[in-house]
């Protein structure tokens, strides 16, 4: 699986999940998030060669097409597969609010 | 929606579905498909600016991150959203077989 267990331990050129730390204030300009100050959102990148974690029949066909026709601009793209939520603390006035934001952390990637 | 109705009628630089005709024999080296000879598989391409058809909270966050930090290599990618099947005819010996292959035709795209 193209997940953090594999991808973070190996120098993988092809489609894999990559570490990306986002600081809410510095990187997004969000001052309203009290905790955490930032988080590992991660992202997916890298080429999608033939049969690499293909998401659908279309991505398999496109991967083969791209392999046999390397001059073509059409190829599958490396995108998130499994995502996890992130719990944040913020304030409305003086009232603390705890919110679970869905699909915030990329845990694995696929070729789509 | 970033679908064929919109994308095929407009010169859109950003994420959109693009026409791609694949000839089974010439492009994939498949001689076994009797009908059709090829089909419009289509593909997704184009930049994913902030809030463009964002698939998840992560792609929204990543889009904002990329907008505010344009030197960053992390950005959402334009990938298929809605796909349709393709019915093919092939022969096993002299026996005709009709098969519906799922997720073969891209009808719309999203930023993931």
């Amino acid at each position: 699986a193209l997940d953090t267990n594999y991808c973070f331990r190996n120098l993988e050129e092809n489609c894999c999940v990559r570490p990306l730390y986002i600081d809410f204030r510095q990187d997004l300009g969000w001052k309203w998030v009290h905790e955490p100050k930032g988080y590992y959102a991660n992202f997916c990148s890298g080429p999608c060669p033939y049969l690499r974690s293909a998401d659908t029949t279309h991505s398999t066909v496109l991967g083969l097409y791209n392999t046999l026709n390397p001059e073509a601009s059409a190829s599958p793209c490396c995108v998130p597969q499994d995502l996890e939520p992130l719990t944040i603390l913020y304030y409305v006035g003086r009232t603390p609010k705890v919110e679970q934001l869905s699909n915030m952390v990329v845990k694995s990637c696929k070729c789509s | 929606a970033l679908d064929t109705n919109y994308c095929f009628r407009n010169l859109e630089e950003n994420c959109c579905v693009r026409p791609l005709y694949i000839d089974f024999r010439q492009d994939l080296g498949w001689k076994w498909v009797h009908e059709p000879k090829g089909y419009y598989a289509n593909f997704c391409s184009g930049p994913c600016p902030y809030l463009r058809s964002a698939d998840t909270t992560h792609s929204t966050v990543l889009g904002l991150y990329n907008t505010l930090n344009p030197e960053a290599s992390a950005s959402p990618c334009c990938v298929p959203q809605d796909l349709e099947p393709l019915t093919i005819l092939y022969y096993v010996g002299r026996t005709p077989k009709v098969e519906q292959l799922s997720n073969m035709v891209v009808k719309s795209c999203k930023c993931s």
Epitope: L51, L68 | L28, W30, K31, W32, E99
Partner: nanobody
Framework: QVQLVESGGGLVQPGGSLRLSCAAS????????MGWFRQAPGKQRELVAI???????NYADSVKGRFTISRETAKSTMYLQMNSLKSEDTGVYYC??????????WGQGTQVTVAS
């Protein structure tokens, strides 16, 4: 029952040659795109060469001009002729059979070691 059996691997010196074979059974071989993949320690499998059901071939840049893939439908067998072998060609070589109508199949792999 589907079986893909690789053979022909072994230890060879740099500059030497090997011929890998992949014998398929239990599948309609003529419909399948056949590929050779290799896996180095701690790495994902990567495509080395492919020959489609209709005979179209393609190679990874790193092996172009050195490796030749072929298939013999009558014997349901695929081959990989590997010449001018380098140490970076070391790894486990896997045979893959893929047909869009069904699932794809993998062999158990054969070890190729290039060392002096």
């Amino acid at each position: 029952q589907v079986q893909l059996v690789e053979s022909g691997g072994g230890l060879v010196q740099p500059g030497g040659s090997l011929r890998l074979s992949c014998a398929a059974s239990g599948i309609s071989f003529s419909y399948y795109d056949m590929g050779w993949f290799r896996q180095a320690p701690g790495k994902q499998r990567e495509l080395v060469a492919i020959v489609t059901s209709g005979g179209r071939t393609n190679y990874a840049d790193s092996v172009k001009g050195r490796f030749t893939i072929s298939r013999e439908t009558a014997k349901s067998t695929m081959y990989l002729q590997m010449n001018s072998l380098k140490s970076e060609d070391t790894g486990v070589y896997y045979c893959n059979a893929h047909w869009i109508v069904t699932t794809d199949y993998w062999g158990q792999g054969t070890q190729v070691t290039v060392a002096s």
